[in-house]
Interface confidence: medium
């Protein structure tokens, strides 16, 4: 029977009643043009609503706005657009929302063409208050705060200026000209690209990385012949254009940019791009481009100082430079990550890996689910997601996968089962032990959110007609109930609930539309009264994560440690609450050659967890380069997974020797280097 | 030889309901679609929907949602597309076809379409008072 | 839904010459297009898959070609069997559709 109908499915008492009394509609009195919405702040109800409309007149097109601003978690809305002055806010810079709890917000106005500069709204009180500010800069990018003081902010204009305010955008200082990108780095630091010449297009590849460690006092240049950089865990990276030719490689630097290394990775061309695709501070993993306009590149591994890479997956599906990667890092549960590659037949499969990219399988099949005809053998096929591609090919699926940190192992997402990804209406399939298996949760596509860390589901059928139907489970996707929140269907645009999937509130945003007007509203929805009571121990089991054969002594072991979770009972109807933790117990592992990632110069045959050498590198001195030297590389085939914490067991030797000889391809050595002071 | 033999033709009263069944044979009835396409007297086609042999999934023209089903029988390698609630501008020849792509989605390349490589002989459903 | 275009509604060729048939869509559909042709009475026979591969059997003097957004199917040297109804339709994003048809008679 279909999900949800089984005999042994509860009701729970009376919850339409205890739904009725918790739900809160709140109609805008606005015509319908578009409308974002923001939280402020983590844990204090605060939500701002911004709408705007554009009348296009002859001439111009004239526009408005109007802010709105809850307390009590989207109930009850407030208008505070006399707050801004009634100004017209420009949506394409949202609203930027500070760090942690600071309670900071800057919206950024338009403002009439001949005028000198732009106009924020500042607040600094969770938007209860707004200061206005015109800046002496037209901005071509939203405020951005520094991730350690949020009365750090820095902005580029139009004219390509970066400017910086230190106290919460009421001063604001040119630091330098001609930047093309900047970010904050750690410490205050401030990273940009600068361009000598025409402009950032022309220069691409000659630009400068400089960096200032006090907000524009003193600069020092720590790259030429930059062609882009980004950060990502503790790793600063550039692409260099190559001396000779017009091909760039990577470089890494994990000291703010003093030192660099040339990452072992392919160089690319024209037409290819590098990307990060996810970075924490013991590793990275970097996509590297195809030749050619194939749609797909090969993912690379990194060790711990992002210089040696080891290959982890071929064909991995990534259209364009910012184009659409599948890759989704599965935050409920360490270690696993899901993506999509093309096969040589031109379709899409999805492949997982549990270990942190060392080694990818195909999703195992859902136990309730039959194979597609993409099949080729109807008993044998797998789970395909839908994720960023499929969204972009406007198939007939409204959310990426879904995961939560504090919601372990579950993870939620579209899907078809067969031999790939299928272009037909997909279903909704979760997980319950982080990828391992999977089960048809909801026939055809839907919304969907976690509330009360895994305590509640929520989803909505996503559909073309108005909706006034919310499905809701207790018990991690296995049944549902259905609550009917309005008798007056609503056009859906979207669900909200408060980032960290802490909250027992969901709001559900659309728009009413009568034959003169329409207008938005949203419907807020608090499950507190059907999780009654607070959960208590017994209310929880424990769950070994990763395990897949409870006979084996090492079972759940990954990275070197296997780790214990308390986790809500299914049958268990009770609140988590915004205060829970995730209780979870590690214990170390044995090392074993599942724990070492195959060294420069090696690889891994599929199905076997040795590493041998690269043919072509039979040998061959292994040589590569680190901060600017050469060196040699002396390995039995194996290193370290980075963040791998196992001890004893299998301990293949590995030793660099210093070759003290200059790397010649290494452009950022320090004596390329140069500081100077305002 | 690889053929697809539908139901006879039909003449139907507006609000009742007609069941077309589409018999495959010759090949491996599970391992392709089946689309349904219409043909109005005089006008062009119009693709219906698509049926997964294995499955029994289905995906169908918004037009069509709500009044039509599509079922399959596996075990008699037969297809079958009912219409509900017919009305006169339902009068039309209707087609099964075999659609060989399955429905793998597409690489940035474009997925590779093989086209509805075998079609049925048709059946006329007329709908009339 | 992708709307497919077809144009002329109706080409008067004499036997013997070319014809050349235009299928546009609204919206890119990559190589996802095929070619049918209808006689009167008959059902669609399949031409051309994959916007420009012959299907099984059917003569070299078809051809199509394009990509993305345009399309051709091109009739050499036109035979007396050819003359009949053609249509284009898509299958990058459901639902399928098929273009108006273009009617090739003889002049």
């Known amino acids: 029977s279909a999900p949800g109908e089984d005999e042994e499915c509860g009701r729970v008492r009376d919850f339409v009643a205890k739904l009725a009394n918790n739900t809160h509609q709140h109609v805008f009195d606005d015509l319908r043009g578009s409308v974002s919405l923001s939280w402020v702040g983590d844990s204090t109800g605060v939500i701002l609503v911004l709408t705007t409309f554009h009348v296009p007149l002859v001439i111009m097109t004239f526009g408005q706005s109007k802010l709105y601003r809850s307390e009590d978690y989207g109930k009850n809305f407030k208008d505070i657009t006399d707050l801004i002055n009634n100004t017209f806010i420009r949506t394409e810079f949202g609203m930027a929302i500070g760090p942690e709890n600071s309670g900071k917000v800057v919206l950024t106005a338009e403002v009439s063409g001949g005028s000198r500069g732009g106009r924020i709204f500042r607040s600094s009180d969770f938007a209860k208050n707004f200061v206005q500010t015109d800046l002496p800069f037209h901005p071509l990018t939203q405020m951005m705060y520094s991730p350690q003081n949020s009365d750090y902010l820095l902005a580029l204009s139009t004219e390509n200026g970066l400017w910086v305010s230190k106290n919460f955008g009421g001063k604001w200082e040119e630091i330098h000209k001609a930047v093309c990108l900047a970010k904050w780095g750690s410490d205050n630091t401030i990273f940009f690209t600068t361009y000598a010449n025409g402009s950032c297009k022309a220069d691409l590849g000659a630009l400068e990385l400089w960096r200032t460690s006090d907000l524009g006092k003193s600069f020092k240049t720590i790259g030429v012949k930059i062609y882009s950089f980004g950060l990502g865990g503790r790793f600063l990276f550039a692409s260099v254009m190559a001396d000779k030719d017009t091909t760039r490689r990577i470089h890494v630097s994990t000291d703010q940019g003093d030192t660099w290394s040339m990452a072992q990775l392919p160089s690319v061309g024209q037409e290819q791009f590098y990307s990060i695709l996810a970075a924490n501070d013991d590793m990275v993993f970097m996509h590297v481009d195809e030749p050619g306009d194939t749609g797909f590149g090969t993912i690379f591994t990194s060790d711990d100082r992002g210089i040696v890479y080891s290959k982890s997956l071929d064909r991995h599906l990534y259209t364009t430079t910012g184009g659409e990667t599948d890759f989704t890092n599965v935050t409920s549960l360490r270690g696993v990550y899901i993506t999509s590659v093309l096969s040589e037949d031109n379709s899409i499969q999805t492949m997982i890996t549990f270990d942190q990219g060392g080694r990818w399988t195909h999703l195992r099949k859902p136990e309730n689910s039959e194979c597609d005809a993409t099949a080729k053998n109807k008993n044998e096929c797998s789970l395909h997601i839908h994720a960023s591609y499929s969204i972009s090919q406007k198939l007939n699926v409204p959310m990426a996968p879904l995961s939560e940190p504090n919601a372990v192992g579950i993870v939620i997402a579209h899907g078809s089962v067969g031999d790939a990804i299928s272009v037909m209406v997909p279903d909704v399939y979760i997980s319950d032990d982080g990828g391992y298996s999977w089960t048809k949760m909801l026939e055809g596509p839907h919304y969907y959110t976690i509330l009360d860390s895994g305590g509640i589901i929520v989803a909505i059928e996503h559909s073309s007609r108005p909706i006034n139907v919310i499905k809701f489970s207790t018990d991690e996707g296995q049944c549902w109930q259905t609550y009917t929140f309005t008798r007056d269907p609503i056009y859906f645009t979207g669900l909200a609930s408060e980032p960290g999937a802490r909250s027992m509130n969901i709001s559900i945003w659309g728009f009413t539309e009568s034959f003169l007007t329409s207008q938005w509203v949203s419907y807020t929805i608090d499950f507190k009264d059907i999780l009654e009571r607070n959960c208590e121990e017994k209310d929880y089991t424990i769950w070994l994560a990763h395990s897949t054969d409870p006979e084996d002594y090492e079972d759940g072991c990954i990275l070197g440690y296997k780790e214990q979770f308390l986790r809500l009972r299914k049958s268990s109807v009770c609140q988590n609450g915004r205060d829970y933790v995730v209780t979870k117990q590690p214990s170390i592992c044995l090392c074993s050659l599942e724990d070492f990632l195959c060294d420069f110069g090696y690889y891994r045959p599929e199905n076997d967890s040795k590493c041998v050498e690269q043919p072509e590198l039979k040998g061959h001195d292994l040589e590569f380069c680190l901060y600017g030297r050469e060196e040699h590389l002396t390995t039995n085939g194996y290193r370290k997974i980075p963040g791998d914490k196992c001890q004893g067991g299998v301990n293949p030797v590995r030793e660099v020797k210093d070759l003290k000889k200059k790397c010649t391809s290494n452009f950022l050595s320090p004596e390329k280097q140069n500081s100077k002071s305002n | 030889q690889v053929q697809l033999v539908q139901s006879g033709a039909e003449v139907k009263k507006p609000g009742a309901s007609v069941k077309v069944s589409c018999k495959a044979s010759g090949y491996t009835f599970t391992k392709y679609y089946m689309s349904w396409v219409r043909q109005a007297p005089g006008q062009g086609l119009e693709w219906m929907g698509i049926i997964n042999p294995i499955g029994g999934s289905t995906s169908y023209a918004q037009k069509f949602q709500g009044r039509v089903t599509m079922t399959r029988d596996t075990s008699t390698s037969t297809a079958y597309m009912e219409l509900s609630s017919l009305r006169s501008e339902d009068t039309a020849v209707y087609y099964c076809?075999?659609?060989?792509?399955?429905?793998?989605?597409?690489?940035?390349?474009?997925?590779?379409?093989?086209?509805?490589?075998?079609w049925g002989q048709g059946t006329t459903v007329t709908v009339s008072s | 839904e992708i709307v497919m275009t077809q144009s002329p509604a109706t080409l008067s060729v004499s036997p013997g010459e070319r014809a050349t048939l235009s299928c546009r869509a609204s919206?890119?559909?990559?190589?996802?297009l095929a070619w049918y042709q209808q006689k009167p009475g008959q059902a669609p026979r399949l031409l051309i898959y994959?916007?420009?591969t012959r299907a099984t059997g059917i003569p070299a003097r078809f051809s199509g070609s394009g990509s993305g957004t345009e399309f051709t199917l091109t009739i050499s040297s036109l035979q007396s069997e050819d003359f009949a109804v053609y249509y284009c339709q898509q299958a990058r994003l459901g639902p399928w559709t098929f273009g108006g048809g273009t009617k090739v008679e003889i002049k």
């Open positions: 919206q890119s559909v990559s190589s996802n």
């Open positions: 076809a075999r659609d060989p792509s399955g429905i793998a989605a597409a690489g940035p390349a474009g997925r590779y379409y093989y086209g509805m490589d075998v």
């Open positions: 994959g916007a420009s």
